[in-house]
Interface confidence: medium
């Protein structure tokens, strides 16, 4: 084991936000720490205060500009440091050269809506939020539907291997309440990960007409 094992993980949302989590075993809860971002080819630098999210982990968001502004590119390198106050000085606790487009995690999809619903199927659309125009169509999605009596973890994943901001759910049960979620991931980036799941969209299929099935 390494004394004071720590993790410093950051992701870029592809536009103007770098979110970071810093955890350290045995760290003092009341220690004041911050993340400092220093780009190699930009005139700005940015700092955010790490706030506790659990017993031994802290998080913060580096806000680089307006939400839809393109603040970094594929050639940028941002030196990220964790600085913690020790007495009268700030000590650099962790460091990394952060390549934003190798460490992507987009915002969760938004504006989910039911386009059309029938007894056995439902067409749902959504939008991506604060995603760089650099991706063009190089995005993929995962979706899941919560059925009555099941958990989200049990829901099978539906994969959309292209930039398709809609889905037609089929083989649904008539007159049944469902919930639906979707998440997005760029194809680019060695350490890129899935966005958080969207807020769930609740919908209900139409009842079967008496004497016939539609």
């Amino acid at each position: 084991a390494v004394n004071g094992t720590s993790q410093f993980t950051c992701f870029y949302n592809s536009r103007a936000n770098i979110s970071c989590v810093w955890s350290q075993d045995g760290a003092l809860q009341d220690t004041s720490c911050q993340v400092h971002a220093w780009p190699d080819r930009r005139r700005w630098n940015q700092t955010c205060e790490l706030l506790p999210v659990s017993q031994a982990s802290w998080a913060c968001n580096l806000i680089l500009g307006a939400p839809d502004s393109q603040k970094l590119t594929t050639v940028d390198i941002v030196t990220l440091r964790v600085l913690c106050r020790e007495g009268v000085r700030w000590r650099v606790m962790a460091i990394q050269d952060f390549k934003p487009f190798e460490n992507l995690r987009l915002m969760a999809p938004i504006s989910l809506q039911v386009v059309h619903v029938e007894t056995h199927r439902c067409n749902i659309s959504w939008e991506i939020s604060q995603a760089s125009h650099y991706f063009e169509r190089h995005l993929e999605f995962e979706a899941r539907t919560l059925s009555p009596g099941h958990t989200w973890e049990e829901a099978p994943l539906l994969t959309l291997k292209q930039k398709q901001e809609w889905i037609c759910l089929e083989t649904l049960t008539p007159d049944t309440q469902y919930e639906f979620q979707v998440r997005v991931k760029p194809l680019q980036g060695e350490f890129t990960t899935w966005s958080p799941w969207s807020q769930p969209l609740a919908f209900r299929t139409k009842p079967a007409a008496l004497g016939k099935d539609t």
Partner: nanobody, 123 residues
Framework: EVQLVESGGGSVQAGGSLRLSCAAS????????MGWFRQAPGKEREFVVA????????DMPDSVEGRFTISRDNAKNTIYLDMKNLKPGDTAVYYC????????????????WGEGTLVTVSS
């Protein structure tokens, strides 16, 4: 995969100096933050210092501050730890490490370790 090979360890009298080297092969060297850890007999492995590909460094523990210096030569795929005014308390196996960031092991990342080089400081 990254391979790390340390060298430069040995025995030295208190007050003496050593220069440790760590040669890396494999992935693009400048992409990786490199650093040094040490493990004294009977103790846990301890983080000493790290340097990013662009040359930024972490602060060192108070016990070595002002005596140890880290540097890197990206053209030679090598990092160095210059140690002066060595003390018996510096006796340890010194390990080179490489990852996206140090002393961290980010989620989903791999941290690469060398085999270590022994430094013995006698009084």
């Amino acid at each position: 995969e990254v391979q790390l090979v340390e060298s430069g360890g040995g025995s030295v009298q208190a007050g003496g100096s050593l220069r440790l080297s760590c040669a890396a092969s494999g992935r693009t060297f400048s992409d990786y933050t490199m650093g040094w850890f040490r493990q004294a007999p009977g103790k846990e492995r301890e983080f000493v210092v790290a340097i990013t590909g662009t040359g930024h460094t972490t602060d060192m523990p108070d016990s070595v501050e002002g005596r140890f210096t880290i540097s890197r030569d990206n053209a030679k795929n090598t990092i160095y730890l210059d140690m002066k005014n060595l003390k018996p308390g510096d006796t340890a196996v010194y390990y080179c490490a490489s990852a996206r960031g140090l002393p961290v092991t980010p989620l989903g990342d791999i941290i690469y370790w060398g085999e270590g080089t022994l430094v013995t400081v006698s009084s």
